[in-house]
């Protein structure tokens, strides 16, 4: 199965938003200034993220406005931290066969989730919808992001991403274009596209689950239509 994720290159520039999606709704992961992490039904300045891809499928997720790294404690709680701890603030990224992405802690094995329950990631599992993420480009004007990215204490302050945290100077395209069948972006409420004017559009159905028991890999299901 081709890797459709935009996150697995050595670096993927620009701001993105991670969101969960079911047939009727979506929640964007946001990292607040106080470190609280939750979901919002729409893109916000706190859901604008930078995702740094590292070796072996690891990613580092940063909230641009909160200037906090997404981290996880030993109980599986996710939170935003100004300090980068490699054990708590790096996540293993995996694209499921249905085109959705999951992130789990290599240290504690829990999934990043917008739901309150803490669940360990098991290969081949079918996680609940609030633990499966899609990514969408940022649609919030850059003027709202007049703030530096947090310094990663284990790296040089002269790193490219430090000097141009929003990647406005040299924007990059997606490393691997998403195949239409599996990684197509959904319109958001803020889009002005024709699809957004009909956000429910009869675009596609909801989650297609090809295995009733939820133990094997899912098929490449159409993405949900949501509001």
């Amino acid at each position: 199965y081709p890797n459709a994720s935009p996150l697995l290159g050595s670096s993927w520039g620009g701001l993105i938003h991670l969101y969960t999606a079911t047939a009727r709704n979506s929640y964007h992961l946001q990292i607040h200034k106080n470190g609280h992490v939750d979901g919002a039904p729409h893109q916000t300045i706190y859901s604008a993220l930078m995702i740094r891809s590292e070796d072996a499928g690891f990613v580092v997720i940063t909230g641009v406005m909160s200037r906090r790294y997404l981290c996880m404690d030993f109980r599986g709680n996710i939170f935003g931290s100004h300090y980068f701890d490699p054990e708590n603030c790096r996540f293993q990224h995996q694209t499921l066969e249905n085109g959705y992405d999951v992130y789990h802690s290599p240290q504690y094995h829990f999934l990043v989730s917008l739901g309150r329950a803490k669940r360990a990631f098991l290969p081949g599992m079918n996680p609940p919808p609030y633990s499966q993420f899609l990514s969408r480009r940022n649609e919030i004007p850059l003027i709202h992001f007049n703030t530096p990215i947090p310094r990663r204490h284990t790296r040089s302050a002269e790193d490219d991403s430090e000097r141009d945290p929003l990647n406005v100077l040299k924007p990059r395209a997606r490393m691997t274009p998403a195949p239409a069948s599996c990684s197509q972006e959904l319109p958001s409420a803020e889009d002005n596209s024709p699809m957004a004017s009909d956000p429910l559009g009869v675009v596609r159905g909801g989650r297609v689950n090809t295995h009733a028991g939820g133990t094997g890999p899912e098929g490449c299901r159409p993405f949900a239509k949501f509001i």
């Epitope: 079911t22 939750d38 979901g39 039904p41 329950a117 609940p128 956000p199 939820g214």
Partner: antibody, heavy 117, light 106 residues
Framework: QVQLVQSGAEVKKPGASVKVSCKAS????????MHWVRQAPGQGLEWMGI????????SNAQKFQGRVTMTRDTSTSTVYMELSSLRSEDTAVYYC??????????WGQGTMVTVSS | AIQLTQSPSSLSASVGDRVTITCRAS??????LVWYQQKPGKAPKLLIY???SLESGVPSRFSGSGSGTDFTLTISSLQPEDFATYYC????????FGPGTKVDIK
């Protein structure tokens, strides 16, 4: 604390419309979708639709397409559900419920709508 | 659409009994299942989310289990205030409810 307070009971004639309100307090209104669920006398719970509080976009159960209109007023943190072309089988208690990603965690007290000629 | 079936549709039990209610989904829904309790004239009350997580403030005699298609709500020792109707709901695709299980006094 989170509260969802609904408008009072209504009696309507067949063919008329009814508009039920649900005022939210105790949380950031625009951070949670809101649902409408109804329950006919002696029957189970029936999901009607959902509204995005920031954009006002809605999605309704197929059964109610064309008859239900959900709106919101962010200035007063209130959502509304209007059901048109009422018939006797629409007699039910109508609830608003807050979406908490993994459950409907808070519910309004319910609004009884009676459709009778 | 995913259909939920609950069994039994009603049951009679005594205070102190162990009560088990099952909910079956027509296709796999992972752990995206919720249980509610409803008493006459009242709004539903959240008991269990994500199939097995107890909502804050809910007594520990309530527990949920299951994943995929088969789920269970268990009341370890039925109390007088537990006589009510219980509904399951799936959040995997849409927001469908099960038909409910009424627990009444034997």
């Amino acid at each position: 604390q989170v509260q969802l307070v609904q408008s009072g009971a209504e009696v309507k004639k067949p063919g008329a419309s009814v508009k039920v309100s649900c005022k939210a307090s105790g949380y950031t209104f625009t951070n949670h979708y809101m649902h409408w669920v109804r329950q006919a006398p002696g029957q189970g719970l029936e999901w009607m639709g959902i509204i995005n509080p920031i954009s006002g976009s809605t999605s309704n159960a197929q059964k109610f397409q064309g008859r239900v209109t959900m709106t919101r007023d962010t200035s007063t943190s209130t959502v509304y559900m209007e059901l048109s072309s009422l018939r006797s089988e629409d007699t039910a208690v109508y609830y608003c419920a807050r979406d908490a990603v993994d459950a409907f965690d808070f519910w309004g007290q319910g609004t009884m709508v009676t459709v009778s000629s | 659409a995913i259909q939920l079936t609950q069994s039994p549709s009603s049951l009679s039990a005594s205070v102190g009994d162990r009560v088990t209610i099952t909910c079956r989904a027509s296709q796999g829904i992972s752990s995206a299942l919720v249980w509610y309790q409803q008493k006459p004239g009242k709004a539903p009350k959240l008991l269990i989310y994500d199939a097995s997580s107890l909502e804050s403030g809910v007594p520990s005699r309530f527990s949920g289990s299951g994943s995929g298609t088969d789920f269970t709500l268990t009341i370890s020792s039925l109390q007088p205030e537990d006589f009510a109707t219980y509904y399951c709901q799936q959040l995997y695709d849409d927001f469908d409810f099960g038909p409910g299980t009424k627990v009444d006094i034997k």
